[in-house]
Interface confidence: low
Amino acid sequence: VPGEAEQPAPELVEVEVGSTALLKCGLSQSQGNLSHVDWFSVHKEKRTLIFRVRQGQGQSEPGEYEQRLSLQDRGATLALTQVTPQDERIFLCQGKRPRSQEYRIQLRVYKAPEEPNIQVNPLGIPVNSKEPEEVATCVGRNGYPIPQVIWYKNGRPLKEEKNRVHIQSSQTVESSGLYTLQSILKAQLVKEDKDAQFYCELNYRLPSGNHMKESREVTVPVFYPTEKVWLEVEPVGMLKEGDRVEIRCLADGNPPPHFSISKQNPSTREAEEETTNDNGVLVLEPARKEHSGRYECQGLDLDTMISLLSEPQELLVNYVSDVRVSPAAPERQEGSSLTLTCEAESSQDLEFQWLREETGQVLERGPVLQLHDLKREAGGGYRCVASVPSIPGLNRTQLVNVAIFGPPWMAFKERKVWVKENMVLNLSCEASGHPRPTISWNVNGTASEQDQDPQRVLSTLNVLVTPELLETGVECTASNDLGKNTSILFLELVNLTTLTPDSNTTTGLSTSTASPHTRANSTSTERKLPEPESRG
């Protein structure tokens, strides 16, 4: 209207998508009667009547707002529910009396975008490209208004830089009116960027203020030529025979070149190519001393056909040879002396130990073991252990059996066995001596003999308990070229109902047990036998 004062700026109302906007009609009583108001939406300068207030009662006009408007605050406020981006416009209320006045409200709508999704270029980027190449794409979906994107490398924001960094952003409008932003980062990368972390950040506004969301960090495959190849050996440190050793070629280029590993032939001094597994790794399993030597790696770039050679690397597989003991099978008379000597070779300094096989007791720290005034108990196994103290687990051993000449020696002289008549007894008898004795029984039954070690024998007898047997008892006799010896087993009847918890066992090597079945067993407690020879 000519001469009228300029309209004041509209009141700003900010809401998030999906929430309710409260549009308060700011007309004072002097400007109009709030019980008689018309509400309009203004879009592209076109007014559309959307709501009427008459005598404080509201009435929606047909159209896009029909279902979403209601009156609040005794008619002074119009509530617009489920706000959409399309609702971002001016709304005005117009009082009818005493004269036509209007009040304008600018509705601003906001929606936080979803978490930014970043995708790295899977094909990677060569360092020698002439212009910026696509590094990654950042997508921020369903935001309003359009969020701003900032790209970061190693935590620092990236700026447009001619021929170096280019950020190409575009947006699409979804049917909901929300925006999806896509931003492509293009850059010229250098070798040092192979570990660089890139991410994008979306900046957006909400009624509560400014906010931002960050994507995950990504690295991009960077391709650069190989300048150096080298060998790596696993495990690191001292190697020993039996280890699994992996020799692999490494290069500072990406992709790595085609590798081959060669070893210098000690006779011809020529480098001979070794056979690697499918992954280009030379696996030595188990490693042997013959694997020791000078290795080198060749890297061949199949694109340029440029070949690079590594520095040679000396590999030492430490070893201990077979252990030799002399004499190898000593036989001695009681009372005599014996010197046992142990020998072995190694790539490192060796330590020797002599142990008693049966007990594991260390008898001597050194290669020579001297035994004096030999008793029959000194017979049996002695083990020499040759070890490299600087390399745990690197050792070899050799067992030698010492035989002491003598007549049979019984494990027990006599023993009481509890039995029940008509039981089948399992009796055992053990003797040792050199030469190794044989065992016989004084009663009929099923007997079997087991050689426990070069000087020791165990005989077992299955026999039925009869009144005669109870009377006579059982004898076992061991004999060799140098004499004989006897053990006696006394059989005593036991009533099953009067058995006490410990009355079913006897001392010594045999036990006799009574069971509900008419059978009893007398079994030997066996010692673990040493192996004739074993190596570490």
Epitope: P255, P256, H258, T275, N277, D278, N279, V283, E285, L302
Partner: antibody, heavy 117, light 107 residues
Framework: QVQLEQSGPGLVKPSETLSLTCTVS??????????WSWIRQHPGRGLEWIGY???????YHNPSLKSRITISVDTSKNQFSLKLSSVTAADTAVYYC?????????WGQGTLVTVSS | EIVMTQSPATLSVSPGERATLSCRAS??????FAWYQQKPGQAPRLLIF???TRATGIPARFSGSGSGTEFTLTISSLQSEDFAVYYC?????????FGQGTKVEIK
């Protein structure tokens, strides 16, 4: 536990291209530890090694088939593929994908590909 | 390429008996060698690698030996589930090559 799952058509027309894909689960192709191979077996016959691909894209093909083979890898999908062009009835076989190291410990289930019009 | 030759082509054995399969390489392949078992409609199964090392889960009745050009697979006591075709393979050189197979059948 590493598993290899094969996919692709069982029927191909002569002179067309055979395409198979092998998807690896329980382990990453990109780990760089293994090669990934294709092997085939003609009906009632023995095994014929076709070629391998490494995660970096480097390949080696059986010279007898070389000019017709394309092996590719998609590390983002953890899968590798075989294309054999200009097929004839002689290419009818069960095709296997396998993980190569010291021998082939893990195999796909096999795909019978018949070349017929 | 390295040619792998298996013998015999067919081996007829009774359950519980011992089976010995041979494979010869046309040139030395050190111990870069594997044995596989294949049953109808199934993919091959790795039995032995490194010429003598049993793969995970393979019973002790399977054993491998040899180095260079001559290799042997021994099944000490054949079980019903062992009747199958057995292939040898070298992984010393490219291309990888397989033997033509030995069928172990019930006698």
């Amino acid at each position: 536990q590493v598993q290899l799952e094969q996919s692709g058509p069982g029927l191909v027309k002569p002179s067309e291209t055979l395409s198979l894909t092998c998807t690896v689960s329980g382990g990453s192709i990109s780990s760089g530890t293994y090669h990934w191979s294709w092997i085939r077996q003609h009906p009632g016959r023995g095994l014929e090694w076709i070629g391998y691909i490494y995660y970096s894209g480097s390949t080696y093909h059986n010279p007898s088939l070389k000019s017709r083979i394309t092996i590719s890898v998609d590390t983002s999908k953890n899968q590798f593929s075989l294309k054999l062009s200009s097929v004839t009835a002689a290419d009818t076989a069960v095709y296997y994908c396998a993980r190569g190291g010291d021998g082939y410990r893990y195999w796909g289930q096999g795909t019978l590909v018949t070349v017929s019009s | 390429e390295i040619v792998m030759t298996q013998s015999p082509a067919t081996l007829s054995v009774s359950p519980g008996e011992r089976a010995t399969l041979s494979c010869r390489a046309s040139q030395s392949i050190s111990n870069n060698f594997a044995w596989y078992q294949q049953k109808p409609g199934q993919a091959p199964r790795l039995l032995i690698f490194g010429a003598s090392t049993r793969a995970t889960g393979i019973p002790a009745r399977f054993s491998g030996s040899g180095s260079g050009t001559e290799f042997t697979l021994t099944i000490s006591s054949l079980q019903s589930e062992d009747f199958a075709v057995y292939y040898c393979q070298q992984y010393n050189n490219w291309p990888r090559t397989f033997g033509q197979g030995t069928k172990v059948e019930i006698k």
